[in-house]
């Protein structure tokens, strides 16, 4: 007799075979907060940007990617203290002289009003009220994200 | 009438409520290769180490972490071409003067026989036969990993 989880595995495998849909995350892991179709983890310790990226990666997640101003505001509403800064997945690409998300896309200049310089070794942090350019070596908190909903036919672009 | 996937979501949620177990990855996504309890994705394009880390992160995965010599050998067996190098999640920490995995642990010197220097801006790559220290700016392929099996009571350490 199979357990419901084992049967589940079979069900999902069969579904995946038909649609290339993978299970995805059906609800947020413990300690992660749901914000719409994402799970967010706000760190309690501090790190430079690169170590923050590595931490999210080892948690099989990404540094926060913000789609638009609306998502920024909703994320900022979860930050309790005005003075605390959190790294997100956006840094300055010197070769392209532009702000670049870690998924390879460039910042739409209307999305975030960044305070501070766009220059080498600059990474983006958010606070309860603002978006700041900081030296990437600055040791602050960070936000990891996991996508919550299973995405139909989600195929990773050829890395 | 619920679909098998919807029922599945309920089953998994009930299970998680009892055990704080989250669904995990029940089988490898399309294009990922299973190696024991991991799913591996071997890139086809090239990137410096830092961009490779970012790519894995946005795929909600980690640059490859290798537990021991046995796992190294099994991973190398999946590499078809002798001349191709792949980044893994290990680089040189200047402050600690040691090789450090991206999950924060240090390399056990017996695990990998590294060819090349342990110095600033050095990152680790693997080929079909060897392990090399390369400048982190070198553009080569990389390997991302996802843990396959659901881990009971997996609680992320307080970041």
């Amino acid at each position: 007799q199979k357990s419901s989880i084992e049967k589940c595995s079979v069900d999902i495998q069969q579904s995946r075979n038909k649609t290339t849909e993978r299970p995805g995350l059906l609800n947020c892991p413990i300690y992660w907060q749901q914000l719409r179709e994402k799970c967010l983890l706000f760190s309690h310790t501090v790190n430079p940007w690169n170590n923050s990226l590595a931490d999210c990666s080892t948690k099989e997640s990404s540094l926060l990617l913000i789609r638009d101003k609306d998502e920024l505001i909703h994320t900022q509403n979860l930050i309790r203290d005005k003075a605390i800064l959190f790294w997100i997945g956006l840094n300055f690409s010197l070769s392209e002289k532009n702000w670049k998300w870690i998924n390879g896309s460039f910042l739409n200049s209307n999305d975030l009003e960044i305070r501070g310089d766009a220059k080498e070794n600059s990474c983006i942090s958010i606070s309860q009220t603002s978006v700041y350019s900081e030296y990437c070596s600055t040791e602050i908190r960070w936000i990891c994200q996991k996508e919550l909903t299973p995405v139909r036919n989600k195929v990773y672009p050829d890395s | 009438q619920k679909s098998s996937i919807e029922k599945c979501s309920v089953d998994i949620q009930q299970s998680r409520n009892k055990t704080t177990e989250r669904p995990g990855l029940l089988n490898c996504p399309i294009y990922w290769q299973q190696l024991r309890e991991k799913c591996l994705l071997f890139s086809h394009t090239v990137n410096p180490w830092n961009n490779s880390l970012a790519d894995c992160s946005t795929k909600e995965s980690s640059l490859l972490l290798i537990r021991d010599k046995d796992e190294l050998i099994h991973t190398q067996n999946l590499i078809r071409d002798k001349a191709i190098l792949f980044w893994i999640g290990l680089n040189f920490s200047l402050s600690e003067k040691n090789w450090k995995w991206i999950n924060g642990s240090f390399l056990n010197s017996n695990d990998l026989e590294i060819r090349g220097d342990a110095k600033e801006n050095s990152c680790i790559s693997i080929s079909q036969t060897s392990v090399y220290s390369e400048y982190c700016s070198t553009e080569i392929r990389w390997i991302c990993q996802k843990e396959l099996t659901p881990v009971r009571n997996k609680v992320y350490p307080d970041s």
């Epitope: 005005k82 605390i84 603002s130 600055t138 040791e139 602050i140 | -």
Partner: antibody, heavy 122, light 108 residues
């Protein structure tokens, strides 16, 4: 109890050296930017130096650059200031201060020690 | 370096008075400003950070405002324990982190 306690102050001749220590307790020391701030008798406050949580980033005020060295030992919850080539104008109460959590290099000092007096005189 | 100019340098006031201290930065510092209170022989105490955020445990009669170059600390109703020297401090991301010259609040 959350506190910072400085020690190591005293009377020293011009050109001499002194090492100040600051013992932290009651909080996770390794998560915080730490600074030294000084106050000459009857004068205002002057920021001297800061060190990041990991110790990787350090800054000094121009007035002490090349003479003072800040360091930390996270395992011992301790902050240090090695002061060399001391001058009369370095005479001050030296405070150890913690920055408000995770504001990065925006250093609001939310916890201060009581200070230790350094007197440089011949 | 960014200079901070506090005014007045001293103020005489009575218990219950409203006291306002200003701090002007030599260049724009957004909201990266703090206010501290220091009593004789004691370490400074953080009152306000991020120009207007009240530090935990600080009475609500203290408030801060301003952004850019002009900032204000207001004590709405002066209490006996508020007689002290007050300092502003700029905390932009590049050192040095300068303090204002201080404002002494004395009993009239």
């Amino acid at each position: 109890q959350v506190q910072l306690v400085e020690s190591g102050g005293g009377l020293v001749k011009p050109g001499g050296s002194l090492r100040l220590s600051c013992a932290a307790s009651g909080f996770t020391f390794s998560d915080y930017y730490m600074s030294w701030i000084r106050q000459a008798p009857g004068k205002g406050l002057e920021w001297v130096s800061y060190i990041s949580p990991s110790g990787a980033t350090i800054y000094y005020a121009d007035s002490v650059k090349g003479r003072f060295t800040i360091s930390r030992d996270n395992a011992k919850n301790s902050l240090y200031l090695q002061m060399n080539s001391l001058r009369a104008e370095d005479t001050a109460v030296y405070y150890c201060a913690r920055s408000l959590m995770s504001t990065g290099t925006h250093l609001y000092f939310d916890l201060w020690g009581r200070g230790t007096l350094v007197t440089v005189s011949s | 370096d960014i200079q901070l100019t506090q005014s007045p340098s001293s103020v005489s006031a009575s218990v219950g008075d409203r006291v306002t201290i200003t701090c002007r930065a030599s260049q724009g510092i957004s909201s990266w400003l703090a206010w501290y209170q220091q009593k004789p022989g004691k370490a400074p105490k953080l009152l306000i950070y991020a120009a207007s955020s009240l530090q935990s445990g600080v009475p609500s009669r203290f408030s801060g405002s301003g952004s850019g170059t002009d900032f204000t600390l207001t004590i709405s109703s002066l209490q006996p324990e508020d007689f002290a020297t007050y300092y502003c401090q700029q905390v932009t991301s590049v050192p040095p982190y300068t303090f204002g010259g201080g404002t002494k609040v004395e009993i009239k």
